[in-house]
Amino acid sequence: QGWQAFKNDATEIIPELGEYPEPPPELENNKTMNRAENGGRPPHHPFETKDVSEYSCRELHFTRYVTDGPCRSAKPVTELVCSGQCGPARLLPNAIGRGKWWRPSGPDFRCIPDRYRAQRVQLLCPGGEAPRARKVRLVASCKCKRLTRFHNQSELKDFGTEAARPQKGRKPRPRARSAKANQAELENAY
């Protein structure tokens, strides 16, 4: 599946995807989050704060087609993809440009869906088969959630709603991602 288009407004259009875009590859394996570091306790963050400026969980608009077997939605649907590193990130002086830069602080927070919405889509099928209707779950908003370690199982906890919203008015710094990584992120999902 190749890219059909790549827009500059953080909206990717990809043909014939299933119900969900996938989480970024770094979220795909819970083993990285199941290590019993620090005796199974989250590391101490001396600068842990709920200041919204320290979180970079952002919502990217993503347009895709919904598929079910050989059938494809007549129109693409638009939803959000949760992206960015969740804090508590420490704002540290940038020696080069006197600005600030983000330093992610490990896998203790994750930018994941907070709310979903349902949308009914009409799927067109080949070979004269009757159209199908499907109700799909679409990401409606994203949030930083804290990871706690619990019997070596990963568990996501809400982090205060004031830190949950993507930063308005701040241009997010895009992470360098290869086309291959993006492709892995956006494979068929249901």
């Epitope: 996938e22 989480p23 079910d68 994750r110 994941i112 494979e187 249901y190």
Partner: antibody, heavy 116, light 111 residues
């Protein structure tokens, strides 16, 4: 073909812990939401927990704070860590694949008995 | 809590049609076409029979059909056969799309 195989059930005392596993094959595991559903002996189906493909987790009130759902996409395996078990948790536990907001494939189930 | 209510039992003779109802609050059945139906034989795992009110997965007989009126969804089985004898459960999801609820189940007896 799609297959879900649960394991890890058994006899445990009240207050004890147990971890269930569900090995999946025949589909792109990481792309699907997955649930645990249980059925007490002679009773109906009860939804327990679901995990999204992003790793977000949700629970029935009856198990919140005691059970933890997780997934390992590298192993195509779903887990349910059950702590502080009670007699009323005795049931057959099924893992089920969630596609388009319904459960299209189910495992054969694993029996958990909580008794002293 | 949201609840789905089903009759405890229904029965019918071979060749007849029967209908199993599933009644819920507007937030889980009435406002959204999201009811699915599962068949469960004794000692076996549930099997999806109907989803999104009236869609049949491939491999499920066209004798099974679903419908919805107001806040009541229904499963109709026509041309009843002995192998249809089983428990049937309706299911829906919560408004958040992140929780599910099952009806109490209906035992179908083929006389």
């Amino acid at each position: 073909q799609v297959q879900l195989v649960e394991s890890g059930g058994g006899l445990v005392q009240p207050g004890g812990s147990l971890r269930l596993s569900c090995a999946a094959s025949g589909f792109t595991f990481r792309s699907h939401w997955l649930s645990w559903v249980r059925q007490a002996p002679g009773k109906g189906l009860e939804w327990v927990s679901v995990i999204g493909n992003w790793g977000d987790t949700y629970y029935a009130d009856s198990v919140k704070g005691r059970f933890t759902i997780s997934r390992d996409n590298s192993k195509n395996t779903l887990y349910l860590q059950m702590n502080s078990l009670r007699a009323e948790d005795t049931a057959v536990y099924y893992c089920a694949r969630d596609t388009y907001l319904h459960f299209d494939y189910w495992g054969q189930g694993t029996l958990v008995t909580v008794s002293s | 809590d949201i609840a789905l209510t089903q009759p405890a039992s229904v029965s019918g003779s071979p060749g007849q049609s029967i209908t199993i109802s599933c009644t819920g609050t507007s937030s889980d059945v009435g406002d959204i076409n999201d009811v699915s139906w599962y068949q469960q034989h004794p000692g076996k795992a549930p099997k999806l029979m109907i989803y999104d009110v009236n869609n049949r997965p491939s491999g499920v007989s066209n004798r099974f059909s679903g419908s919805k009126s107001g806040n009541t969804a229904s499963l109709t089985i026509s041309g009843l056969q002995a192998e249809d004898e089983a428990d049937y459960y309706c299911s829906s999801y919560g408004e958040s799309l992140t929780s599910y609820v099952f009806g109490g189940g209906t035992k179908l007896t083929v006389l």
